[in-house]
């Protein structure tokens, strides 16, 4: 049968059963994935919106498959073994009383069995195992897998020591504190900071610790993923997007039509087909564009590229390049350099590196 | 390369009966979902019955539910749509469809035959 | 019941217009939707499943967007191959269909 062809997988909960607080919504389904990504080297993420690997959905009846819910009883849930699509979503019936605990249909132990499905497990026939086809409600803060449920699941995914790196050729979802994580584009927007890798975004807020990961086609799904550079006019609420030869402008976090245009409207040389990175500085109004171990400055209100440029990186910005992955702009004086796994805090008053960072360090790794 | 050839059609007097044949080749036939729709003459779509990969569950449409029943034998890699008591509105093409491989139905058409028509008149 | 409403029911465009096709259903479907293309006397094609992914080897022209009740399917610029009839779908429920003519 079909298994996912990769260690990272996304699941969103679509909507929430009014049976239970939202809160304990969560709770109880993050700890059915964490059951089994305990006995396998799976790593399970929430993301909030967009399309996620496994979609969790309540409904009643007819509900967009051909397997109409029944009402209370009989049938609990359903999920539908790895694809893409509908593959992997689970879906549980809202006439059922979903709960907590013993009374009504314990969520968690339901979670359990229906994510066996949604990673590829049939039923089992030993009834002592979470895959056998009845429910049955045990002890949810004993609950363990069974040895058949634990055979039948590393069968498909091998035991949590396979955990090495796998290359990521399905643009999976990285892992946020890999020490080897590198970004492809950098940009502030507002009073957060988006980080792109691969069809991802992270989102940190502010001084918050915690960051939430969306697909790129989520918040905007005209755009491509794999954005190469990005950067941010506070001031007029733009945000200017790169990929190849083209860039997006997203105005108020709305993409603006007409767009993607050529990036040479800017002004850069033919031979230029890509842009690695960009920042703006908004005390200069000028955007930097870094372009291999060159760079070139933009006068963001006489729209037209500031003459004597390029120029090279490592010769203007001390201890810089020679190439860059991302730039942003922060805090009035710093620049946040990327280079593979690592980041540089740069203060462009001082022309100087004051801090030396893992590019992943804004995530509380 | 995913083949499915329909087989069966023709032409039946109202009342009459009639069974269709779909052939599959170039995959792994006894996994998948397996359905049939149905396009009258100058119509849209209409989605007619489904099957489940080790012969159920069934699903049929209101419109033929008790006349028609899906079938397949996955030793021979075939789907089989037996039609009794066909009408004038029965008249159409008829298409197999490949869904997904799994437990339960996706409605995801990946693979059509060619179809195969079916004339009811008298 | 689950009930498909395509619109329009037909449209005349030229070849390098953008296209926009929509698909309603009266109750939410999430991203459970499929776009077929078909061609008189030939079998359809599906073009983009779930919403809004791209059936391996359709042009990247075509696209899909939409969850819930509301989808559209756009073809960015259209090319003289690209005038066929067009059905959304939903487990087994199609939409009328929308046929794409040359202005």
């Known amino acids: 049968g079909p298994v996912w062809r990769k260690h990272y997988i996304t699941y969103r909960i679509n909507n929430y059963t009014p049976d239970m607080n939202r809160e304990d919504v969560d709770y109880a389904i993050r700890k059915a994935f964490q059951v089994w990504s305990n006995v396998t080297p799976l790593k399970f993420s929430k993301i909030n919106t967009g399309m996620a690997d496994i979609l969790v959905v309540f409904a009643r009846g007819a509900h967009g498959d051909f397997h109409a819910f029944d009402g209370k009883g009989g049938i609990l849930a359903h999920a539908f073994g790895p694809g893409s699509g509908i593959g992997g979503d689970a879906h549980f019936d809202e006439d059922e009383f979903w709960t907590t605990h013993s009374g009504g249909t314990n969520l968690f132990l339901t979670a359990v069995h229906e994510i066996g499905h949604s990673l590829g497990l049939g039923h089992s026939s030993d009834p002592k195992a979470v895959m056998f086809p009845t429910y049955k409600y045990v002890d949810i803060n004993t609950f363990r897998l069974s040895a058949d449920d634990i055979r039948g699941i590393q069968s498909l995914y091998g035991d949590p020591k396979e955990n090495q790196r796998l290359p990521n050729p399905d643009n999976s979802e990285p892992a946020l504190c890999d020490p080897n994580l590198s970004f492809d584009a950098v940009t502030t927007v507002g009073n957060k900071i988006f980080f792109f890798k691969d069809r991802f975004f992270w989102l940190k807020v502010s001084e918050r610790p915690k960051t939430s990961v969306n697909l790129i086609s989520s918040l905007w799904p005209t755009l491509p993923s794999g954005i190469e550079a990005a950067y941010e006019i506070e001031a007029r609420n733009q945000v200017f997007l790169f990929k190849d030869d083209k860039y997006w402008l997203i105005s108020n976090l709305r993409p603006e039509p007409n767009y993607p245009k050529s990036i040479h409207s800017f002004g850069f040389p033919n031979f230029v087909k890509k842009i690695d990175a960009a920042v703006f500085n908004p005390r200069f109004y000028r955007t930097y564009f870094f372009v291999d171990n060159q760079y070139w400055r933009y006068d963001e209100r006489r729209q037209m590229m500031d003459p004597g440029y390029p120029k090279l990186i490592t010769k203007n910005f001390q201890g810089i390049g020679p190439k860059i992955d991302a730039v942003f702009y922060s805090k009035n004086k710093y620049y946040y350099f990327f280079q593979g796994s690592n980041q540089f805090e740069y203060d462009f008053l001082l022309q100087r590196i004051t801090k030396t960072l893992k590019s992943n360090s804004w995530f509380g790794c | 390369e995913v083949q499915l050839l329909e087989s069966g059609g023709g032409l039946v007097q109202p009342g009459g009966s009639l069974r269709l044949s779909c052939a599959a080749s170039g995959f792994t036939f006894s996994p998948y979902w397996m359905h049939w729709v149905r396009q009258a003459p100058g119509k849209g779509l209409e989605w007619v019955s489904g099957i489940g990969p080790s012969g159920g569950p069934t699903f049929y449409a209101d419109s033929i539910k008790g006349r028609f029943t899906i079938s397949r034998d996955n030793s021979k890699n075939t789907l089989y749509l037996q039609m009794n008591s066909l009408r004038a509105e029965d008249t159409a093409v008829y298409y197999c469809?490949?869904?997904?491989?799994?437990?339960?139905?996706?409605?995801?058409?990946?693979?059509w035959g060619r179809g195969t028509l079916v004339t009811v008149s008298s | 019941d689950i009930q498909m409403t395509q619109s329009p029911s037909s449209l005349s465009a030229s070849v390098g217009d953008r296209v926009t096709i929509t698909c309603r259903a009266n109750?939410?479907?999430?991203?459970?939707l499929n776009w077929y293309q078909q061609k008189p006397g030939k079998a359809p094609e599906l073009l983009i499943y779930?919403?809004?992914s791209l059936q391996s080897g359709v042009p990247s022209r075509f696209s899909g967007s939409g969850s819930g009740t509301d989808f559209t399917l756009t073809i960015s610029s259209l090319q003289p191959e690209d005038f066929a009839t067009y059905y959304c779908?939903?487990?087994?429920?199609f939409g009328q269909g929308t046929k794409l003519e040359i202005k």
């Open positions: 109750q939410s479907i999430y991203t459970y």
């Open positions: 779930a919403a809004s």
């Open positions: 779908q939903q487990a087994g429920i």
């Open positions: 469809a490949r869904d997904i491989w799994g437990a339960y139905a996706s409605g995801l058409f990946d693979y």
